[in-house]
Interface confidence: low
């Protein structure tokens, strides 16, 4: 169960119900008091692990992981360091459901850094945990070359110059 702004959301056998039967969104309070919305449907995809994971203040919990959305902007490397200093890492997206959750929590016009860059050593797009990107799930728009880092905007992943300053997402 997840209580969010007075609405009790229940996840039962993959379907959702709440007292008001809205096709509306639940709310979670995250950084700076900002309320970011996620759909009840997405919440119901949460694994049981989500019930036990405790996220730090100002972090948003989803599917057993904790997420922090920045309001300021930094380069990719500065964002990377920022997350590490907080015992987390830049966002690693595992599937389209997670992408949908992230997108629900971003302004549609913003580019946001994620934990994916083009490494000259491997000559491939690599997540910050060292794993390669699954090209069957994600397509990166733009050049695959040295000093390219990935940012998301409107459910798409873009190749951007790593020195550009964008918002970012930390995850643990």
């Amino acid at each position: 169960l997840l209580v969010s702004q007075g609405v009790l959301l229940k996840c039962q056998k993959g379907s959702c119900s709440n007292a008001t039967q809205y096709e509306d969104t639940g709310d979670l309070k995250v950084n700076n008091g900002t309320r970011r919305n996620i759909s009840n449907k997405d919440l119901c995809a949460s694994r049981s692990a989500d019930q036990t994971v405790l996220c730090q203040s100002e972090w948003l919990k989803y599917q057993g992981k904790c997420y922090w959305f920045s309001n300021e902007m930094k380069s990719w490397s500065d964002s990377y360091v920022y997350c590490l200093e907080r015992k987390s890492h830049l966002l690693i997206i595992h599937d389209q459901l997670e992408m949908a959750f992230i997108q629900k929590n971003l302004r549609q016009l913003n580019y946001v850094w994620i934990g994916l860059n083009f490494t000259s050593l491997k000559m491939t797009w690599t997540w910050v945990d060292g794993s390669p990107i699954d090209s069957k799930i994600f397509f990166i728009k733009g050049p695959a070359k040295e000093n390219s880092c990935a940012a998301i905007k409107e459910s798409k992943i873009f190749s951007e110059t790593c020195s550009s300053v964008f918002k970012w997402i930390c995850q643990y």
Epitope: E23, D24, T25, N32, G33, T34, R35, R36, N37, S39, N71, E72, M73, K104, N105, R107, Q108, L109, N110, Y111, E154, V165, F166
Partner: antibody, heavy 114, light 113 residues
Framework: SLEESGGRLVTPGTPLTLTCTAS????????MSWVRQAPGKGLEWIGI?????ATYYASWAKGRFTISKTSTTVDLKISSPTTEDTATYFC??????????????WGQGTLVTV | AQVLTQTASSVSAAVGGTVTISCQSS????????LGWYQQKPGQPPKLLIY???KLASGVPSRFSGSGSGTQFTLTISGVQCDDAATYYC?????????????FGGGTEVVVK
């Protein structure tokens, strides 16, 4: 705060540029919008320039208006004004603590008469 | 292009009464609830009251409330005060990648008796 300037009486077809001067915050961190209001009429959204400089226009405004910005100003160019462009023009800043694009800070507006 | 329709151009209410203003969108707003409400008084810029359909903007009295999802939205003023006499606009956000990002409704004037 936001302050619009450049509004005046112009003849039809004479290009006009309106300027919105921002103080107390950085335009590189906020999406900005232009909205107009004809005398006695409702609000009409013209377009947005996002924090990175990308522009988005209302379908009716494409080709007629151009939004650009510097570090401290946001400009709205009316390429060829017609009498229907007579209105008060407002610039507005996104509300920083909301998820959706709503406009929490507005200038007082500048009047354009064509 | 999307259209936001505020059916009543003017509504009246007695002091202490309740007024309801509706806003209907020709298509669902972004994320189902990305709709805002503004108050505008003559000679002044608009003031943000409600965002994301039901959330009160900072400094706005609690007598203002919003509801709705998808295409149907409502602004309610409970315990109307003389100071609430103004024109109220809804504003919907839509996907910027395909259509107009923002659209305003035509406005509803609230007259307080």
């Amino acid at each position: 705060s936001l302050e619009e300037s450049g509004g005046r009486l112009v003849t039809p077809g004479t290009p006009l540029t309106l300027t919105c001067t921002a103080s107390g915050f950085s335009l590189s961190s906020y999406d900005m919008s232009w909205v107009r209001q004809a005398p006695g009429k409702g609000l009409e959204w013209i377009g947005i320039i996002d924090n990175g400089g990308a522009t988005y226009y209302a379908s009716w405004a494409k080709g007629r208006f151009t939004i650009s910005k510097t570090s401290t100003t946001v400009d709205l160019k009316i390429s060829s004004p017609t009498t229907e462009d007579t209105a008060t023009y407002f610039c507005a800043r996104e509300n920083p603590t909301t998820h959706s694009l709503v406009w929490g800070l507005w200038g007082q507006g500048t009047l354009v008469t064509v | 292009a999307q259209v936001l329709t505020q059916t009543a151009s003017s509504v009246s209410a007695a002091v202490g009464g309740t007024v309801t203003i509706s806003c209907q969108s020709s298509q669902s707003v972004y994320n189902y609830n990305w709709l805002g409400w503004y108050q505008q008084k003559p000679g002044q810029p608009p003031k943000l009251l409600i965002y994301e359909a039901s959330k009160l903007a900072s400094g706005v009295p609690s007598r203002f409330s919003g509801s709705g999802s998808g295409t149907q939205f409502t602004l309610t003023i409970s315990g109307v005060q003389c100071d609430d006499a103004a024109t109220y606009y809804c504003q919907g956000e839509f996907s910027c990648s395909s259509v107009d990002c923002n659209v305003f409704g035509g406005g509803t004037e609230v007259v307080v008796k």
